[in-house]
């Protein structure tokens, strides 16, 4: 008999190499049975994971699995780092493995580097 526990299918040590300035969707694959759990994204800051408020998220429902998506429109250099999704289900908190975004800044040094860029030219 198939388990009806909520499961989050982010692979251990998964990573994405992405470009700043373009959109990206970070997916959290969620398996559930009857009621869809409440899912959130957070970004790791040392040992704590800071909940991402004010960020655009959406659900994509497929036949056997659903995806809770964190939208980056667009990716920013500051988005570099590790993320985790968490599900609240029947008073239980289920946390995924972390997934890491490696952001490459595509703007060359000749194209009006900002003060932030000058201070920290490379993020990946």
């Amino acid at each position: 008999k198939e388990s009806c526990d909520v499961q989050l299918y982010i692979k251990r040590q998964s990573e994405h190499r992405i470009l700043a300035g373009d959109p990206f969707e970070l997916e959290c694959p969620v398996k559930y049975c009857a009621n869809r759990p409440h899912v959130t994204w957070c970004k790791l800051n040392g040992t704590t994971c800071v909940k991402l408020e004010d960020r655009q998220t959406s659900w994509k429902e497929e036949k056997n699995i659903s995806f809770f998506i964190l939208h980056f429109e667009p990716v920013l250099p500051n988005d570099n780092g590790s993320y985790r999704c968490s599900a609240n289900f029947q008073s239980n908190l289920i946390e995924s493995h972390s997934t890491t975004l490696y952001v490459t800044d595509v703007k060359s040094a000749s194209e009006r580097p900002s003060k932030d860029e000058m201070a920290s030219r490379f993020w990946a």
Partner: antibody, heavy 120, light 106 residues
Framework: QVQLKESGPGLVAPSQSLSITCTVS????????VHWVRQSPGKGLEWLGV???????SYNPAPMSRLSISKDNSKSQVFLKMNSLQTDDTAMYYC??????????????WGQGTSVTVSS | QIVLSQSPAILSASPGEKVTMTCRAS?????MHWYQQKPGSSPKPWIY???NLASGVPARFSGSGSGTSYSLTISRMEAEDAATYYC?????????FGGGTKLEIK
């Protein structure tokens, strides 16, 4: 220096389609996004959509079904096509460059706009 | 969609007077941009990401706020500041603008 220039038909008949070209200089369409924003007396400023550097698009869900944005990187041109125009699509249409900093994104350089009137 | 409500719609100020206009969002946003527009011209970036002045903007302008409430302040009004100011959010698609505050000189 960075410049964006829109060219459009000026007058469009109701139910017809609108095509506007944005020609840019001073930056590459493979590095920066280009947005379309319109301004009408009734609706104020309205973001329509964006052509991202990598070639993907994002649209405002409201007029999305009537909108299409494309580009030609080699000609430094971005195109807006809008179908089934009605009188309330009468507006000034702007193309605008998008740029990111370390932790935010904004529209920085605006074209002078092209005026579109929908009338028979 | 996130609705941005600007107040007041019209503001009249004397030279040298302190001016504050506000922008309220229907949902929390990460930051707010402000644009200035004068009749017959395109909007110009004025304040980026809540508090960063765009290039060439006089230091008498400042921006502040967080969450759902943001403001633009002019420490001492000058004649050249007369214009319409729009707030703009880039947190959630569709990326919306406020209805504008028209600032007039007395």
């Amino acid at each position: 220096q960075v410049q964006l220039k829109e060219s459009g038909p000026g007058l469009v008949a109701p139910s017809q389609s609108l095509s506007i070209t944005c020609t840019v200089s001073g930056f590459s369409l493979t590095t920066y996004g280009v947005h379309w924003v319109r301004q009408s007396p009734g609706k104020g400023l309205e973001w329509l959509g964006v052509m991202w550097p990598g070639g993907r698009t994002s649209y405002n869900p409201a007029p999305m079904s009537r909108l299409s944005i494309s580009k030609d990187n080699s000609k430094s041109q971005v195109f807006l096509k809008m179908n089934s125009l009605q009188t309330d699509d009468t507006a000034m249409y702007y193309c605008v460059r998008g740029d990111y900093e370390y932790d935010y994104y904004a529209m920085d350089y605006w074209g002078q706009g092209t005026s579109v009137t929908v009338s028979s | 969609q996130i609705v941005l409500s600007q107040s007041p719609a019209i503001l009249s100020a004397s030279p040298g007077e302190k001016v504050t206009m506000t922008c309220r969002a229907s949902s929390s946003v990460s930051y707010m941009h402000w644009y200035q527009q004068k009749p017959g011209s395109s909007p110009k970036p004025w304040i980026y990401a809540t508090s960063n002045l765009a290039s060439g903007v006089p230091a008498r302008f400042s921006g502040s706020g967080s969450g759902t409430s943001y403001s633009l302040t002019i420490s001492r009004m000058e004649a050249e500041d007369a214009a319409t100011y729009y707030c703009h959010q880039w947190s959630s698609n569709p990326y919306t603008f406020g209805g504008g505050t028209k600032l007039e000189i007395k």
